[in-house]
């Protein structure tokens, strides 16, 4: 499963999709066994996982994945060189950073090697499929007696490409207060009560300048500020996902 296979053809993503027939489509029976959909996510622009539901296959089948970019030098499909497995059956492909081109149409082909006509070609805009790492190094500092500033860092992705969701609440609050912060990894809370204990957390997404990803990162580790003498209701500090 580690070999790279090149399937050469001009205009591959168009030509490979054709059924050589002059019969009108309504007379063609729909494929009896549709292939599972491929779902791809680019993790922090470090690697990409393209996965499919291998258990949807009626028989254990090692499906193969080939990919290419719409605008590429050699216009060839390349086989996955690092398959992911579920119960010893292929269920995904991991693609490394060098092979990720965010701003070219990504063409992915899933195929049953036993039945070459069982093939599905999908097209994806990878810039809409980026999931950043959770923000790190959350630090709190006092700007003034009652004003707090929260700062954080994001690894490997330019700050201007990210949008942040900040949530905070005090030990007296039943729900989070949340706000969107665009592109700048800091936020200030103008008025805090030093008799309360505050919890802050942040997550990020690749949106809207460099991409349109709807997927948020995981939440950062929470940070706390304020009185440690206040009696706290532990249930209020259960951080829901």
């Amino acid at each position: 499963w580690s070999s790279k296979v090149l399937m050469s053809s001009a205009n591959e993503d168009i030509k490979a999709d054709l059924i050589l027939t002059s019969t009108a489509p309504e007379h063609l029976s729909a494929p009896t066994l549709p292939l599972p959909e491929v779902q791809c996510f680019v993790f922090n622009i470090e690697y990409m996982n393209c996965t499919w539901n291998s258990s949807s296959e009626p028989q254990a089948t090692n499906l193969t994945l080939h990919y290419r970019y719409k605008v590429s030098d050699n216009n060839t499909f390349q086989e996955c060189s690092h398959y992911l497995f579920s119960k010893e059956i292929t269920s995904g492909c991991q693609i490394q950073k060098e092979d990720i081109q965010l701003y070219q149409t990504f063409v992915v082909q899933l195929q049953d090697p036993q039945k070459p006509q069982r093939r599905a070609v999908q097209k994806l805009n990878l810039q809409n499929l980026v999931i950043p790492r959770a923000p790190e190094n959350l630090t709190l500092s006092n700007l003034s007696e009652s004003q707090l500033e929260l700062r954080w860092k994001s690894r490997h992705i330019k700050e201007r490409c990210l949008q942040y969701l900040v949530q905070y609440r005090s030990n007296r609050d039943r729900s989070w207060t949340e706000l969107i912060v665009n592109h700048e990894p800091r936020f200030s809370l103008p008025s805090v009560d030093e008799l309360k204990r505050y919890t802050f957390r942040v997550r990020s997404r690749y949106n809207p300048i460099c991409g349109s990803s709807q997927q948020w990162s995981k939440w950062s580790q929470p940070v706390h500020w304020g009185s440690h003498t206040v009696e706290e209701n532990p249930s209020l500090f259960a951080l829901e996902a």
């Epitope: 999709d17 054709l18 059924i19 549709p34 070609v121 999908q122 097209k123 805009n125 499929l129």
Partner: nanobody, 126 residues
């Protein structure tokens, strides 16, 4: 079951425009990837354009910049706006639908589509 009905085809002079419609009945389009394909007499069926229900659209190189794919989910209709038509665009145009779980899935392979319309004839005269 999804029924697809195309309309909007016709005879047009080279350089002209047409707008094709694909109306669906029986099911909302909100979880379907949609595609347009065409077939000229004696030719292979050809991918024209496709989209995902998340809003990504893709085009064959031969139509890029001239054709625009759009959908109106409220009306359960997809459209293909065709501008600067050329005689080589003459074909029967088919609309197709494929149920998908993921908002980002767009299929350019005809064998990925479960549902097809009857087609509408587009003739471009020189």
């Amino acid at each position: 079951q999804v029924q697809l009905v195309e309309s909007g085809g016709g005879l047009v002079q080279a350089g002209g425009s047409l707008r094709l419609f694909c109306a669906t009945s029986g099911r909302t389009l909100s979880r379907y990837a949609m595609g347009w394909f065409r077939q000229a007499p004696g030719r292979e069926r050809e991918f024209v354009a496709c989209d995902s229900w998340g809003g990504d659209t893709f085009y064959a190189d031969s139509v890029k910049g001239r054709f625009t794919f759009s959908r109106d989910s409220a009306k359960n209709t997809v459209y293909l706006q065709m501008n600067s038509l050329q005689p080589e665009d003459t074909a029967v145009y088919y609309c197709a639908a494929a149920p998908t779980s993921f908002a980002t899935t767009a299929y350019s392979s005809s064998n990925s589509y479960a549902y097809w319309g009857q087609g509408t004839q587009v003739t471009v005269s020189s």
